[in-house]
């Protein structure tokens, strides 16, 4: 790391070290030999989240309902607004600039992890002994019916998309 001319939370200007503005404030004027750095608080709709020498604060993010966004956490002078997606939708990126509907798991697949505002549905193929016959964003793979416990026998084998079909046991005549 190269040497720096100033302390932490300072910056070099005109061969002298001036104090940076604290988070939530913007630079109005650099320090001089006789005056300190002049800083001003950001307005209500703006923020700066680091020690800085910015002359303009950043605008808070707008959570556009037309893009399926809603406010998860209101911004302050030191933090940006955090957006999340409305019910049934999730963010398309880490910065959550737009939303898309949750994916449904097709027949033969079940939900491994239900979607959140920031992550999509995770599906998994139904293993042997389980099935899913619906397209759903919530349903897990369900186990095949156990014919034996109902005193029935398997008449038709199950698949990953269908349950087994049970039927009565054949009675052998004497």
């Amino acid at each position: 790391e190269p040497p720096t001319a100033c302390r932490e939370k300072q910056y070099l200007i005109n061969s002298q070290c001036c104090s940076l503005c604290q988070p939530g404030q913007k630079l109005v004027s650099d320090c001089t030999e006789f005056t300190e750095t002049e800083c001003l608080p950001c307005s209500e709709s703006e923020f700066l989240d680091t020690w800085n020498r910015e002359t303009r604060c950043h605008q808070h993010k707008y959570c556009d309902p037309n893009l399926g966004l809603q406010v998860q956490q209101k911004g302050t002078s030191e933090t940006d607004t955090i957006c999340t997606c409305e019910e049934g939708l999730h963010c398309t990126s880490e910065s959550c600039e737009s939303c898309v509907p949750h994916r449904s798991c097709l027949p033969g697949f079940g939900v491994k992890q239900i979607a959140t505002g920031v992550s999509d549905t995770i599906c998994e193929p139904c293993p042997v002994g389980f099935f899913s016959n619906v397209s759903s964003a919530f349903e897990k793979c369900r186990p095949w019916t156990s014919c034996e416990t109902k005193d029935l026998v398997v008449q038709q084998a199950g698949t990953n998309k269908t349950d087994v079909v049970c039927g009565p046991q054949d009675r052998q005549r004497a």
Epitope: C6, R7, E8, Q10, S15, S19, E33
Partner: antibody, heavy 126, light 107 residues
Amino acid sequence: QVQLVQSGAEVKKPGASVKVSCKASGYTFTGKYMHWVRQAPGQGLEWMGWINPDSGGTNYAQKFQGRVTMTRDTSIPTAYMELNRLRSDDTAVYYCARDQPLGYCTNGVCSYFDYWGQGTLVTVSS
Amino acid sequence: DIQMTQSPSSVSASVGDRVTITCRASQGIYSWLAWYQQKPGKAPNLLIYTASTLQSGVPSRFSGSGSGTDFTLTISSLQPEDFATYYCQQANIFPLTFGGGTKVEIK
């Protein structure tokens, strides 16, 4: 009262490393930068760099870049200075020195040393 | 780096004398200058900071002046305990730099 107590004298061979410690007491260790200054026999004072004990941030003089490492352990309030690849011209007394706390420093780095360790003589000789 | 040039490198004086040491910076450093006194085998001792502010506990016979590039340390009436080496140090930007020192000796 403020005290900076350094580790004892060291004799090292060229190419070796030395680690000098500086134990602080009598003030909030994390509140003031700690600097290291050295003085070769019969010579003047030479600034080596600083560590901010609060953040662990460091700043080294260009001359020592890549050869010096300053660290700290806030639990036992102690600062350390390690110098690698020692040469005979590194023979010097090494001092730790605390920043003078200037509340009204409007510009400049305002690093004045109001308390010093007793010094650690490091002799580099084959 | 800012170079600090001290003069003279040594001065012979008697007890009671007025002694003046000068320090020149290679570029303007406003008032960000300190003066230290060092006795043999001891760590330096802060005398003056921000060019003219006397450090707590330092006798008032020591004074500092100057700003920009030219600075002065004055000992108004030299005392036996003042025979030592004096260093200036700029505190405007890193790297901090010291003058080469001025040794005040007994005449």
